[in-house]
Interface confidence: medium
């Protein structure tokens, strides 16, 4: 009875094995000769020499002995500090990359099945990427006083600085601070400039936007792709291989379709206030028959910092009074088509591919840094008109303040959010046969290999 039980158990075992493998009966075991022109199964490759479908080696292994007509591939484990990531038939495992440098963080350890991945630590960006991780990290540029962050650093691109436009300032050396609007004073003691806020006299000032420095998030490197770094005005040292692009037109261009509406708003407002003032003066004259003095303080209109960079604000157009200290760097790029349309998706700018005329592919945030109100450009114009009776030369002033906020440009077509720049994808171009066993992993890349390398599979599996 015992032999019957053994045979029954064996039969059941074989059935279970067959069910688990579910292979065609004719070609259940490797190596086997396929029909000419047909494909081998998953995790098999076609050996041109043996003319057989043979087993691939699993990740973490390599082919120690290649298959023949009568014997299958013999696999062996990868040695220390070597790996194979995919099913393969490489004769030797690939060496893991060198240890991460001091400016890098090891985000993936070297194992038998995966390469070590090094990414840049916070405050650094990847200046030279490799297939996975980063080859060379560089510190993020710091914008000196008078310059703010135009584009924050990412894991693969440096910070881009820009001179603070009229009406904004930055008094820090920082890789995160943007230009902030000057505070609005009832009476200005010291006018603000690009590197200093306005100083008010006695009465409490107001700000056109939320006070305090606006900090941009520091990038945390995860997976790097190469982005062509672009030099910007900065006090921070820049890595030696970044060459300046040569002079460009002043910051953000000097013309634009924003000029007309801003001019109209400011003009009409000023005109209206002037008329009101004149009417007041006439009334006062009629009533008191005293001379009038018409004082007007027109404050520079303010935009929220970096608001809707998809369209150019009035500061960027230099339409209004330019603060004495504000400057335009010759390195700053003019607004080109790419300026407004480059996405912020960490899409790499391929080596050798430059943004037309600009020397950079500027990423636009698509929406406001500080205002939840969408893509429109808000112009905050505050006019204070003091109408004084001056018979005794004492200051009896009736103040009339007018504040105008206009949403001038909220057309969705200007939103750069979803527009793609057709940068060429070069990250695969750097894959060498030595770096990627995947060329032997069922791919049929049409490049001859060194003589010792086995053949490609019949078709990718």
């Amino acid at each position: 009875m015992a032999p019957v039980a053994v045979w029954a158990a064996l039969a059941v075992g074989l059935e279970l094995w067959a069910a688990a493998h579910a292979l065609p009966a004719q070609v259940a075991f490797t190596p086997y000769a396929p029909e000419p022109g047909s494909t081998c199964r998953l995790r098999e490759y076609y050996d041109q020499t043996a003319q057989m479908c043979c087993s691939k080696c699993s990740p973490g292994q390599h082919a120690k002995v290649f298959c023949t007509k009568t014997s299958d591939t013999v696999c062996d484990s990868c040695e220390d500090s070597t790996y194979t990531q995919l099913w393969n038939w490489v004769p030797e495992c690939l060496s893991c990359g060198s240890r991460c440098s001091s400016d890098q963080v090891e985000t993936q350890a070297c194992t038998r099945e995966q390469n070590r991945i090094c990414t840049c630590r916070p405050g650094w960006y990847c200046a030279l990427s490799k297939q996975e991780g980063c080859r060379l990290c560089a510190p993020l540029r710091k914008c000196r006083p008078g310059f703010g962050v135009a584009r924050p650093g990412t894991e693969t691109s440096d910070v881009v600085c820009k001179p603070c436009a009229p009406g904004t300032f930055s008094n820090t050396t920082s890789s995160t601070d943007i230009c902030r609007p000057h505070q609005i004073c009832n009476v200005v003691a010291i006018p603000g400039n690009a590197s200093m806020d306005a100083v008010c006299t006695s009465t409490s000032p107001t700000r056109s936007m939320a006070p305090g420095a606006v900090h941009l998030p520091q990038p945390v490197s995860t997976r790097s792709q190469h982005t062509q770094p672009t030099p910007e005005p900065s006090t921070a040292p820049s890595t030696s291989f970044l060459l300046p692009m040569g002079p460009s037109p002043p910051a953000e261009g000097s013309t634009g379709d924003f000029a007309l509406p801003v001019g109209l708003i400011v003009g009409v407002t000023a005109l209206g206030l002037l008329i009101i003032g004149v009417v007041n003066c006439v009334i006062m004259t009629q009533v008191k028959k005293k001379p009038l003095c018409l004082q007007r303080e027109a404050k520079v209109p303010h935009l929220p910092a970096d608001k809707a960079r998809g369209t150019q604000g009035p500061e960027q157009q230099h339409l209004l009074i330019t603060a004495p200290s504000s400057s335009s760097s010759s390195l700053e790029s003019s607004a080109s088509a790419l300026d407004r349309r480059a996405p912020t998706r960490n899409q790499p700018q391929a080596p050798g591919v430059e943004a037309s005329g600009a020397g950079e592919a500027r990423a636009s945030t698509g929406s406001s840094d500080s205002s939840p109100g969408g893509h429109g450009t808000q112009v905050n114009v505050t006019c204070i008109v003091n109408v004084c009776s001056s018979s005794d030369h004492s200051s009896q002033c009736s103040s009339q303040a007018s504040s105008t906020m206009g949403d001038t440009d909220s057309s969705p077509s200007e939103s750069p959010k979803d527009e793609q720049v057709p940068f060429s994808k070069e990250e695969c171009a750097f894959r060498s046969q030595l770096e990627t066993p995947e060329t032997l992993l069922g791919s049929t890349e049409e490049k001859p290999l060194p003589l010792g390398v086995p053949d490609a599979g019949m078709k990718p599996s």
């Epitope: 029909e35 022109g37 041109q48 003319q51 001859p448 053949d455 490609a456 019949m458 078709k459």
Partner: antibody, heavy 116, light 107 residues
Framework: QIQLVQSGAEVKKPGASVKVSCKAS????????MSWVRQAPGQGLEWMGW????????TYADDFKGRVTFTLDTSTSTAYMELRSLRSDDTAVYYC?????????WGQGTLVTVSS | EIVMTQSPATLSLSPGERATLSCKAS??????VSWYQQKPGQAPRLLIY???NRYTGVPDRFTGSGSATDFTLTISSLQPEDFAVYYC?????????FGQGTKLEIK
């Protein structure tokens, strides 16, 4: 569809060399070995050797060693066979053929005539 | 080298008849034998591979059999288009070799 297209007929003098091309299309060139077979007029098939299309490693039959060279241009999916020091008995139709184990596709053949 | 010997050299049969072509290898070639059909002015055409596997598109009247050193190609009922020269070839060891061919002609 799969095709192997060979270069045209050649007439050569004894001692000269001939280079026959075979352009493959309709499949991944580097997947299958490329064999070279010749057939003298009224005679049988004679295997000259083959080339491993992925690595470029050739294997030559003993009768042709030293006189024949197989090469590849994978960018154009073309295999080449060069035969040197031609003799009158090298007059034959030369075929390129895909694979080794059951050669499933053949070129149309290139007639090489060696005559003084 | 392995010598492949085909017999008969010529076989004269009528359409509808059964044809049996023989191929003997001088050494064991396991089942690494293929059969080819060649018509005048044309390249050879693969019929059978691995001694007994019919290639795609080949009519089922063609059957291959045998192993080691003795191999047979059988055409069960000859059609007019079957009259041609048939070659066997081994791809077991270098140099790969072909038989001298069997000419199948109409009687």
């Amino acid at each position: 569809q799969i095709q192997l297209v060979q270069s045209g007929a050649e007439v050569k003098k004894p001692g000269a060399s001939v280079k026959v091309s075979c352009k493959a299309s309709g499949y991944t060139f580097t997947t299958y070995g490329m064999s070279w077979v010749r057939q003298a007029p009224g005679q049988g098939l004679e295997w000259m050797g083959w080339i491993h299309t992925y690595s470029g490693v050739p294997t030559y039959a003993d009768d042709f060693k030293g006189r024949v060279t197989f090469t590849l241009d994978t960018s154009t999916s073309t295999a080449y066979m060069e035969l040197r020091s031609l003799r009158s008995d090298d007059t034959a139709v030369y075929y390129c053929a895909r694979g080794l184990y059951g050669v499933d596709y053949w070129g149309q053949g290139t007639l090489v005539t060696v005559s003084s | 080298e392995i010598v492949m010997t085909q017999s008969p050299a010529t076989l004269s049969l009528s359409p509808g008849e059964r044809a049996t072509l023989s191929c003997k290898a001088s050494e064991n070639v396991v089942t690494y034998v293929s059969w080819y059909q060649q018509k005048p002015g044309q390249a050879p055409r693969l019929l059978i591979y691995g001694a007994s596997n019919r290639y795609t598109g080949v009519p089922d009247r063609f059957t291959g059999s045998g192993s080691a050193t003795d191999f047979t190609l059988t055409i069960s009922s000859l059609q007019p288009e079957d009259f041609a020269v048939y070659y066997c070839g081994q791809s077991y060891t270098y140099p790969y070799t072909f038989g001298q061919g069997t000419k199948l002609e109409i009687k």
